[in-house]
């Protein structure tokens, strides 16, 4: 799997999980989230060469098509596969609120 | 939706469905498929600017992150959203076989 266990251990130009820390205030301009101040969002990036972690029949076909037709621009792309939620604390006035924000953290990637 | 109805009607540099006909023999080197000779596989391509068809909270956050941090390389990517199967006919000796190949045709795209 193109996850932290594999990608953060290996120097990999191909599609892989990349570390990215997002500070809510500095990077997004969101001042209302009290905790956490930021989080490890991560992101997916890298080349998708022939059959590198292709996730659908279409991306496999596209991968083969590109190998045979190298001038083509129809190549698969490195995107998130597994995502996890993030729990945040914010305040409504003085009242604390806890919310779970879905699909905020990328755990693994794929070529699609 | 970034589907044929929208994308094939509009000239769109941003993430959109692109037409792609694949000839099994010429483009993939597959001679064993009897029918069809090829099919409209389509593919997804184009830029993913700020919030253009972002499909997850993570891709929305990443989109905002890129707007505020333009030097960052952590941008969403244009990939397939809805896929459909393709039915093929091939022969085992003289015996015809009909198979449905899943996820072979891209019907719409998203930024992920």
């Amino acid at each position: 799997a193109l996850d932290a266990a594999y990608c953060f251990r290996n120097v990999q130009d191909n599609c892989c999980l990349r570390p990215l820390y997002i500070d809510f205030k500095r990077d997004l301009g969101w001042k209302w989230i009290h905790e956490p101040k930021g989080y490890n969002a991560n992101f997916c990036a890298g080349a998708c060469p022939y059959l590198w972690s292709s996730d659908t029949q279409h991306s496999r076909v596209l991968s083969l098509y590109n190998t045979i037709n190298p001038e083509a621009s129809a190549s698969p792309c490195c995107v998130s596969q597994d995502l996890e939620p993030l729990t945040i604390l914010y305040y409504i006035g003085k009242t604390p609120k806890i919310e779970q924000l879905s699909n905020m953290i990328v755990k693994s990637c794929k070529c699609s | 939706a970034l589907d044929a109805a929208y994308c094939f009607r509009n000239v769109q540099d941003n993430c959109c469905l692109r037409p792609l006909y694949i000839d099994f023999k010429r483009d993939l080197g597959w001679k064993w498929i009897h029918e069809p000779k090829g099919y409209n596989a389509n593919f997804c391509a184009g830029a993913c600017p700020y919030l253009w068809s972002s499909d997850t909270q993570h891709s929305r956050v990443l989109s905002l992150y890129n707007t505020i941090n333009p030097e960052a390389s952590a941008s969403p990517c244009c990939v397939s959203q809805d896929l459909e199967p393709l039915t093929i006919l091939y022969y085992i000796g003289k015996t015809p076989k009909i198979e449905q190949l899943s996820n072979m045709i891209v019907k719409s795209c998203k930024c992920s």
């Epitope: 305040y91 409504i92 | 919030l51």
Partner: antibody, heavy 121, light 107 residues
Framework: EVQLVQSGAEVKKPGASVKVSCKTS????????MNWVRQAPGAGLDWMGQ????????NYNEMFEGRVTLTADTSTSTAYMELSSLRAGDIAVYYC??????????????WGQGTLVTVSS | DIVMTQTPPSLSVSPRETASISCRAS??????????MHWYLQKPGQSPQLLIY???NLESGVSDRFSGSGSGTDFTLRISRVEANDTGVYYC?????????FGQGTK
């Protein structure tokens, strides 16, 4: 230019529901809190609740809890306020108003033009 | 709930004079070094518009004839060199506690 454009006036019967829309433009709708405020004829302003469109997070004033539902459609940058079990006391102008952005509960820097809801049998 | 009381309920001011409106909260609206008090003007037939943010910060595009002061429970909005265009209802608003609440208005 930030704009909040609300749907037109409504006339409803007692016990019915009303759904008011607020179409926004000129800013990133999904990343700002959207508030709803009502103003009865000749009266002051009452905060009804708020929604953060990106995640659909909502906070309601207990005074309206159970009768008001706030939703948002990020694809069209439109916020909605639905008020059920309408009664004569709900006759008012209803406003959508964008939160300032520093806090969840905050001042409101842009307002819609208002939607008059009349309840009459 | 925090109750906001504005005085006076109505006010008539001659052009070029100074007007003062008071807003008293039923409990302190100060937290984390800020006063969570804001002022709005609602002109006849219009929506409210934000004038003052966090007790004393002039909102962008608002005339510097408007100023806000105060802390804790007592706040004041001052309008210097009053113009006919300043006619309307002025509201204070707190967001220190849920639910957010407004004063009853000063005309």
């Amino acid at each position: 230019e930030v704009q909040l454009v609300q749907s037109g006036a409504e006339v409803k019967k007692p016990g019915a529901s009303v759904k008011v829309s607020c179409k926004t433009s000129g800013y990133t709708f999904m990343f700002y809190w959207m508030n709803w405020v009502r103003q009865a004829p000749g009266a002051g302003l009452d905060w009804m609740g708020q929604i953060f469109p990106a995640w659909g997070m909502t906070n309601y004033n207990e005074m309206f809890e159970g009768r008001v539902t706030l939703t948002a459609d990020t694809s069209t940058s439109t916020a909605y306020m639905e008020l059920s079990s309408l009664r004569a006391g709900d006759i008012a102008v209803y406003y959508c108003a964008r939160g300032y952005g520093n806090y969840a509960l905050d001042a409101m820097d842009y307002w819609g033009q208002g939607t008059l809801v009349t309840v009459s049998s | 709930d925090i109750v906001m009381t504005q005085t006076p309920p109505s006010l008539s001011v001659s052009p070029r004079e100074t007007a003062s409106i008071s807003c008293r909260a039923s409990e302190s609206v100060d937290s984390y070094g800020n006063s969570f008090m804001h002022w709005y003007l609602q002109k006849p037939g219009q929506s409210p518009q934000l004038l003052i943010y966090l007790a004393s910060n002039l909102e962008s595009g608002v005339s510097d004839r408007f100023s806000g002061s105060g802390s804790g429970t007592d706040f004041t909005l001052r309008i210097s060199r009053v113009e006919a265009n300043d006619t309307g209802v002025y509201y204070c608003q707190q967001n220190d506690e849920d639910p957010l609440s407004f004063g009853q208005g000063t005309k």
